[in-house]
Interface confidence: medium
């Protein structure tokens, strides 16, 4: 049988696994779709992205609201010409998440 | 031009994006490769998995050491025959990570 303390531990873990904005490491170049002769240093930044579990397999954790935050990064051209330049780069930051159907119910609508 | 304080902020962010064990939500059923007539509640647990950025595109963040931690979960059979039972489930927990080549340099060795 199981006691209330064990159930509390399980419930707390479940709450922590649920769909919510989580700090995630994203690669800037692939995020911005930049040309191959420009790259960023650091190549990655921390932002919040929706992640975690949904109760049903037919649902996926998706963002419902997004803000854009500015990160200061070095933009470097290859071959290296000027001293690396600090540029502000806007990256999507998920502020709200929800478990939503993987496809719209009425794809024809 | 950029001042040292700006660089410190960038440096701190970069440290946080680097390849290391990170708390991640994993789906137990796919982790264990369980049959479709058995599922777990909660369906997901939090464990540490390697994630983050590597300095070079040819490297990926991989685990170098792993421990197995036990999580108490309800194992449910479909169709439901008995009261859901609390079972200990062992899940891989990455304790060390490193940026390693995506493929060995000498595949023939």
């Amino acid at each position: 049988f199981y006691d209330i303390e064990t159930l509390k531990v399980i419930d707390e873990e479940w709450q922590r696994t649920q769909c919510s904005p989580r700090e995630t490491c994203v690669e800037v170049a692939s995020e911005l779709g930049k040309s191959t002769n420009t790259f960023f240093k650091p190549p990655c930044v921390n932002v919040f992205r929706c992640g975690g579990c949904c109760n049903e397999e037919s649902l996926i954790c998706m963002n419902t609201s997004t803000s854009y935050i500015s990160k200061q990064l070095f933009e470097i051209s290859v071959p290296l010409t000027s001293v690396p330049e600090l540029v502000p780069v806007k990256v999507a930051n998920h502020t709200g998440c929800k478990c939503l159907p993987t496809a719209p119910r009425h794809p024809y609508s | 031009f950029y001042d040292i304080e700006t660089l410190k902020v960038i440096d701190e962010e970069w440290q946080r994006t680097q390849c290391s064990p990170r708390e991640t939500c994993v789906e137990v059923a796919s982790e264990l490769g369980k049959s479709t007539n058995t599922f777990f509640k909660p369906p997901c647990v939090n464990v540490f998995r390697c994630g983050g950025c590597c300095n070079e595109e040819s490297l990926i963040c991989m685990n170098t050491s792993t421990s197995y931690i036990s999580k108490q979960l309800f194992e449910i059979s479909v169709p439901l025959t008995s009261v859901p039972e609390l079972v200990p489930v062992k899940v891989a927990n990455h304790t060390g990570c490193k940026c390693l080549p995506t493929a060995p340099r000498h595949p023939y060795s």
Partner: antibody, heavy 117, light 112 residues
Framework: QVTLKESGPALVKPTQTLTLTCTFS??????????VGWIRQPPGKALEWLAN???????YYNPVLRSRLTISKDTSKNQVVLTMTNMDPVDTATYYC?????????WGQGTLVTVSS | DIVMTQTPLSLPVTPGEPASISCRSS???????????LHWYLQKPGQSPQLLIY???NRFSGVPDRFSGSGSGTDFTLKISRVEAEDVGVYFC?????????FGGGTKVEIK
Amino acid sequence: QVTLKESGPALVKPTQTLTLTCTFSGFSLSTYGMGVGWIRQPPGKALEWLANIWWEDDKYYNPVLRSRLTISKDTSKNQVVLTMTNMDPVDTATYYCVQVTNPFVFWGQGTLVTVSS
Amino acid sequence: DIVMTQTPLSLPVTPGEPASISCRSSQSLVHINGNTYLHWYLQKPGQSPQLLIYKVSNRFSGVPDRFSGSGSGTDFTLKISRVEAEDVGVYFCSQSTHVPWTFGGGTKVEIK
């Protein structure tokens, strides 16, 4: 407060190797995006960029002098070392250490190196 | 290499009067990222160069507003609206758009 100080021999004989050390404070070369470089100025003449080294140990050299120059760093000591081989009297100059930002904001006081037999 | 040509070589000035220095590059200094990395330094007698203007027209912190920079492409100008005695020294233009980063030959500003 950022400071950089050059040290090395004041006099070098032709064909010898010059070794200069830049000791800096107020920043760390392990900090992301940081660089240290060397610029020289012959007496009464223009400035000439020589080399620089980045936090990741990437190195860039003036192509004209590349074969004679080596730059290295000791992050724990806050030092950058420049070596220049096969010195010639035309290499007589004041050698400056700079913190590499775009543009160069912080410069050392410079050290005069004379090449003479 | 990008050649930076400064004129005049020497500039005798009267305190309170304006002064202008020209800098011409052998190639455009517009970087592929759109910025123009043309900077001006002043080297006072017996001192290291100090930054005055960066990226054509931006005054560095602490630089008096009598100093201004302008220009584009290959032609650039440093202006001093009213020269003061403390402005004497050698003025250098510099480009960091292309490697190797290069400097002009310098313009010596002295009081008449």
